[in-house]
C-alpha cells in the first residue's frame, strides 16, 4: 500500500520508500547485524521507514541492503533518488581506522521478482555515493537532521524489472528515502495535436521522435511531430493542426462557435460574429443564414453581410428626338448594402390602339453605351420607329437581384416616337456609264419613316475630293447625270427626304467615264 | 537473541581486587564497543567509560581512572571490569552495556543483568 | 563536564494519564540523548535514542522531543508496567546520566 506524494508530471515513480505504509521488509545480507530498518518520525511525526547501519567499528565491513523487485513499465532507463543521512566519522570516538563516510548502490536485472538472496556477484555497480557537501537540513521531529540527496541513474534496461541494493563498507548511514523513478514526457497538446504519454530513450542525450495526432474538431495542416528528450521536456514543436470550421482554439481544445457566430475554414482564426442580416441557430455553424429577403451571391464571402437587391432607380427622365431617345435617372435609394449596382434597359413596343399589348423591341433598336450591365445612369436608344409607343423600364440589379427578381427594382417611362427622316439608301447601282453621263438607279430605304418626297443625288470629280459637288433631286429612283468628263472619276451618294428631312447618304459610288462609248450595267463596284 | 551475561555478586575486603566478567553472545562481539556503568545502593547511574571491542582502546571517565581497568578477551567474546584497591565506596551494581553508534545518535541498548560488588571488611 | 537535570525528581500519575518528563543540559548536546527506563532490580532498557527514535519493541506510547539543551520524555497514556526511574543521558567527550526521574503510581 503505497500513500500519496506529489512528484514531477514528467516522473513515473515505481518505487517510494517513504510511500510505503508498514515494514518495508527488504532483505539484508547479514540477516542480523548490519542494515537495520528503523522507524523515524518525520516533521509531521508520521513514522518513516528507513534503514540504517553504522558498523564502524570494525575494518572491512561488507553488509548489503537488497530492495524487493522493481518492475521497469517499459522504461529503458530509470533514476535512483536516494535522500540518507550520514554521519561524520570524526562525531565518533575511537573509530578513525574503521569508519567510512561513502557507500555503493548496485542493480541487477531480473525477470524473476522472487529472488530470495542476494547473489552479490550478480550486481553491476551504479556508483559509490558520498555524502555531498552542500547538504539540506531537514527537520526530522525536532533535531535538523544533515539530509544528502543523490540522483543517480541507470540504463539501457531490457529485462521486465530489477533489484537495487546498497552496500555499506563501514559507513553511519541511514536510507531516508529511495525512490526510483523513470522519466516521461507527460501527454500534452501543442498546436492542437496531442502527444502521448512518452516514455524517454535509453541514452541520456537520445530523442524519441513522436507523432501527435490532432484534437477533436481539428485537422492536420502540417504532421504534427514533437521529440521527447532524456529529461522528460517536450522539444521542438513541428506541424500544427487547426480547428475544423466551425470550431476555433480554446485551451488547446477546439470548441464549437457560440450561437450567433461561425467560422467558415480551417484555419487558425477565431469564430466570428455573424454579419449583418444573418444568423446562426445551432453551435458549429461554418456559415450564417441570411435574414428573410437578404441574400449571398455565389462569390460573396461567409464573411461579408448578407445583402439585398437594390430598390428602384430614382428620378427616371426621358428626352424624345424624332426615333431616338435619351433616358437619364438617379442611383436607387437603397442600394441593398452592396457596391455591384448596375443597370438594364428592357424596351417593350406598344401598339397605339391598346398600350397594353406590348412587344420586345427586338434587335433592330440601338443603345448606347450598351443595353445591360450599365454602370452609368444614362442611355441613348436610336433606330426607333417613328410614330410608335415604346415603354422603356429601367431596372436596377445588383449581385443578389436573380434570388429575388421583384417589379420594386424597376422604374419605366412610356414615349411616342416623332416622324423622321429616313434611312440611308443601302443599293446604289451605275446603269449606264458613257463618256459624258452616267445612269444611276437606287432602292428604297430600309425605313422610309414616312412618304419619300424626293431623292437628292450628290455628286463630284473624285480628284475634288467633294470640295466642289453638284446636287440632282428627282422622285424617282434613278436618274441620268449628264455634262461629266469623260475619262473621269464621280463619286455619288444620294439620299432620301420625307416631311421629316433628309436621311443620310448613301455609301459612295465610284464611276470613271469612258472614253469610248459603251454600255455598262453596274451593281455598285467602281465602273471603268 | 543478543544477551550479555555477567557474573554472580561479589564479597570482597577493602583493599581486594576483582574482576567482573560480560559475555556477548548473539552478534559479532568486535563490532560494537563497550561500556560499564556502576549504580551505587539506591543512587542512579553513574557511567563509568568504555572499550572499543575491536582495538582494545579504553576511554575511562572522570573519577574512574587509575584502580579500574577495561579489558577483553575477543577469543571468548568476553569483556571485563577489573577493580583494584577496593574501598567501600565502590559497592554497587556494576552493568556492561553494548554501545551503539547510529546515524541518529547513541545509546546503550543492550544491557547485562548486573553484577553486586560488596566491599566490606 | 556537561550535567544533566531532569524534573520533577518524582512524578505521581494515575494510569491512563499522561506523563511528561524534562531534562536539561548545562550545554548544548545537539540531538544526541538516550534515555532508558529502570525497575527496581533490573538493569536499565533503552527506551529512545537520537533524542528522538524508538528501538525495535519499544511502545509507541513513548516519544521523545528536543534538541540543544531541552529535551522532553513523554508518555501518552501511563501503563502499571511504566511505573519506573527514567534517566537520559548525553554522548558528549564524557557521557553522563542525569539523576533520573521517578514515575510511581498517585
Known amino acids: 500500500v503505497t500513500g500519496s506524494r506529489v512528484y514531477p508530471a514528467n516522473e513515473v515513480t515505481l518505487l517510494d520508500s517513504r510511500s510505503v505504509q508498514g515494514e518495508l521488509g527488504w532483505i539484508a545480507s547479514p540477516l542480523e547485524g548490519g542494515w537495520e530498518e528503523v522507524s523515524i518520525m518525520d516533521e509531521k511525526n508520521t513514522p518513516i521507514r528507513t534503514y540504517q547501519v553504522c558498523n564502524v567499528m570494525e575494518a572491512s565491513q561488507n553488509n548489503w541492503l537488497r530492495t524487493d523487485w522493481i518492475t521497469r513499465e517499459g522504461a529503458q532507463r530509470v533514476y535512483i533518488e536516494i535522500k540518507f543521512t550520514l554521519r561524520d566519522c570524526n562525531s565518533l570516538p575511537g573509530v578513525m581506522g574503521t569508519c567510512k563516510e561513502t557507500f555503493n548502490l548496485y542493480y541487477y536485472e531480473s525477470d524473476n521478482d522472487k529472488e530470495r538472496f542476494i547473489r552479490e556477484s550478480q550486481f553491476g555497480k551504479i556508483d559509490t555515493i558520498a555524502a555531498d557537501e552542500s547538504f539540506t537540513q531537514v527537520d526530522i521531529g525536532d533535531r535538523i537532521m544533515k539530509l544528502n540527496t543523490e540522483i543517480r541513474d541507470v540504463g539501457p534496461l531490457s529485462k521486465k524489472g530489477f533489484y537495487l541494493a546498497f552496500q555499506d563498507v563501514g559507513a553511519c548511514i541511514a536510507l531516508v528515502s529511495v525512490r526510483v523513478f523513470y522519466k516521461k514526457c507527460p501527454l500534452t497538446v501543442r498546436n492542437l495535436a496531442q502527444f502521448p504519454d512518452t516514455i524517454t530513450g535509453a541514452d541520456t542525450s537520445s530523442l524519441v521522435e513522436v507523432r501527435g495526432s490532432c484534437v477533436n474538431n481539428s485537422e492536420e495542416k502540417d504532421v504534427p511531430k514533437m521529440y521527447c528528450g532524456a529529461d522528460g521536456e517536450w522539444l521542438v514543436p513541428i506541424g500544427n493542426c487547426l480547428c475544423n470550421a466551425g470550431h476555433e482554439e480554446q485551451n488547446g481544445e477546439c470548441q464549437a462557435c457560440k450561437i450567433g457566430y461561425y467560422k467558415a475554414l480551417s484555419t487558425d482564426a477565431s469564430c466570428a460574429k455573424c454579419p449583418p442580416h444573418s444568423y446562426s441557430v445551432w453551435e458549429g455553424a461554418t456559415s450564417c443564414t441570411c435574414d428573410r429577403g437578404f441574400f449571398r451571391a455565389d462569390n460573396d464571402a461567409a464573411s461579408m453581410p448578407c445583402t439585398r437587391p437594390p430598390s428602384a432607380p430614382l428620378n427616371l427622365i426621358s428626352n424624345v428626338n424624332e426615333t431616338s431617345v435619351n433616358l437619364e435617372w438617379s442611383s436607387p435609394q437603397n442600394t441593398g448594402g452592396r457596391q455591384d449596382i448596375s443597370y438594364n434597359v428592357v424596351c417593350k413596343k406598344c401598339g397605339a390602339g391598346d398600350p397594353s399589348k406590348c412587344r420586345p423591341c427586338g434587335s433592330g433598336v440601338h443603345y448606347t453605351p450598351q443595353q445591360n450591365g450599365l454602370k452609368t445612369t444614362r442611355v441613348s436608344i436610336t433606330d426607333l420607329l417613328a410614330h410608335t409607343n415604346y415603354t422603356f423600364e429601367i431596372w436596377a440589379v445588383n449581385g443578389v437581384s436573380k434570388y429575388n427578381p421583384s417589379p420594386d427594382q424597376s422604374v419605366s417611362v412610356t414615349v411616342t416616337t416623332n416622324q423622321a427622316a429616313p434611312s440611308s439608301i443601302a443599293l446604289v447601282q451605275a446603269k449606264e456609264v458613257t463618256r459624258y453621263s452616267v445612269a444611276l438607279a437606287w432602292l428604297e430605304p430600309d425605313r422610309p419613316n414616312g412618304v419619300i418626297l424626293e431623292y437628292e443625288v450628290k455628286y463630284y470629280e473624285k480628284d475634288q475630293n467633294e470640295r466642289s459637288y453638284r446636287i440632282v433631286r428627282t422622285a424617282a429612283r434613278n436618274t441620268d447625270i449628264k455634262g461629266l468628263n469623260p475619262l473621269t472619276s464621280y463619286v455619288f451618294h444620294v439620299r432620301a427626304r420625307t416631311a421629316a428631312g433628309y436621311g443620310d447618304f448613301s455609301e459612295p459610288l465610284e464611276v470613271t467615264t469612258n472614253t469610248v462609248p459603251s454600255r455598262i450595267i453596274g451593281d455598285g463596284a467602281n465602273s471603268t | 537473541q543478543v544477551q550479555l551475561l555477567q557474573s554472580g555478586a561479589e564479597v570482597k575486603k577493602p583493599g581486594a581486587s576483582v574482576k567482573v566478567p560480560c559475555k556477548a553472545s548473539?552478534?559479532?562481539?568486535?563490532?560494537?564497543?563497550m561500556s560499564w556503568v556502576r549504580q551505587a545502593p539506591g543512587q542512579g547511574l553513574e557511567w563509568m567509560g568504555w572499550?572499543?571491542?575491536?582495538?582494545?582502546?579504553?576511554t575511562y571517565a572522570q573519577g574512574f581512572t587509575g584502580r579500574f581497568v577495561f579489558s577483553l578477551d575477543t577469543s571468548v567474546s568476553t569483556a571485563y571490569l577489573q577493580i583494584s584497591s577496593l574501598k567501600a565506596e565502590d559497592t554497587a551494581v556494576y552493568y556492561c552495556?553494548?554501545?551503539?553508534?547510529?546515524?541518529?545518535?547513541?545509546?546503550?541498548?543492550?544491557w547485562g543483568q548486573g553484577t553486586l560488588v560488596t566491599v566490606s571488611s | 563536564e556537561i550535567v544533566l537535570t531532569q524534573s520533577p525528581a518524582t512524578l505521581s500519575v494515575s494510569p491512563g494519564e499522561r506523563a511528561t518528563l524534562s531534562c536539561r543540559a548545562s550545554?548544548?548536546?545537539?540531538?544526541?540523548l538516550p534515555w532508558y527506563q529502570q525497575k527496581p532490580g533490573q538493569a536499565p532498557r533503552l527506551l529512545i535514542y537520537?533524542?528522538?527514535t524508538r528501538p525495535t519493541g519499544i511502545p509507541d506510547r513513548f516519544s521523545a522531543s528536543g534538541s540543544g539543551t531541552d529535551f522532553t520524555l513523554t508518555i501518552s497514556r501511563v501503563e502499571p508496567e511504566d511505573f519506573a526511574v527514567y534517566y537520559c543521558q548525553q554522548y558528549g567527550p564524557s557521557w553522563t546520566f542525569g539523576q533520573g526521574t521517578k514515575v510511581e503510581i498517585k
Open positions: 537520537g533524542a528522538s
Open positions: 552495556a553494548r554501545v551503539r553508534f547510529t546515524v541518529y545518535g547513541d545509546g546503550m541498548d543492550v
Open positions: 548473539g552478534y559479532t562481539f568486535t563490532s560494537r564497543a
Open positions: 572499550i572499543n571491542t575491536n582495538t582494545g582502546n579504553p
Open positions: 550545554q548544548s548536546v545537539s540531538s544526541n
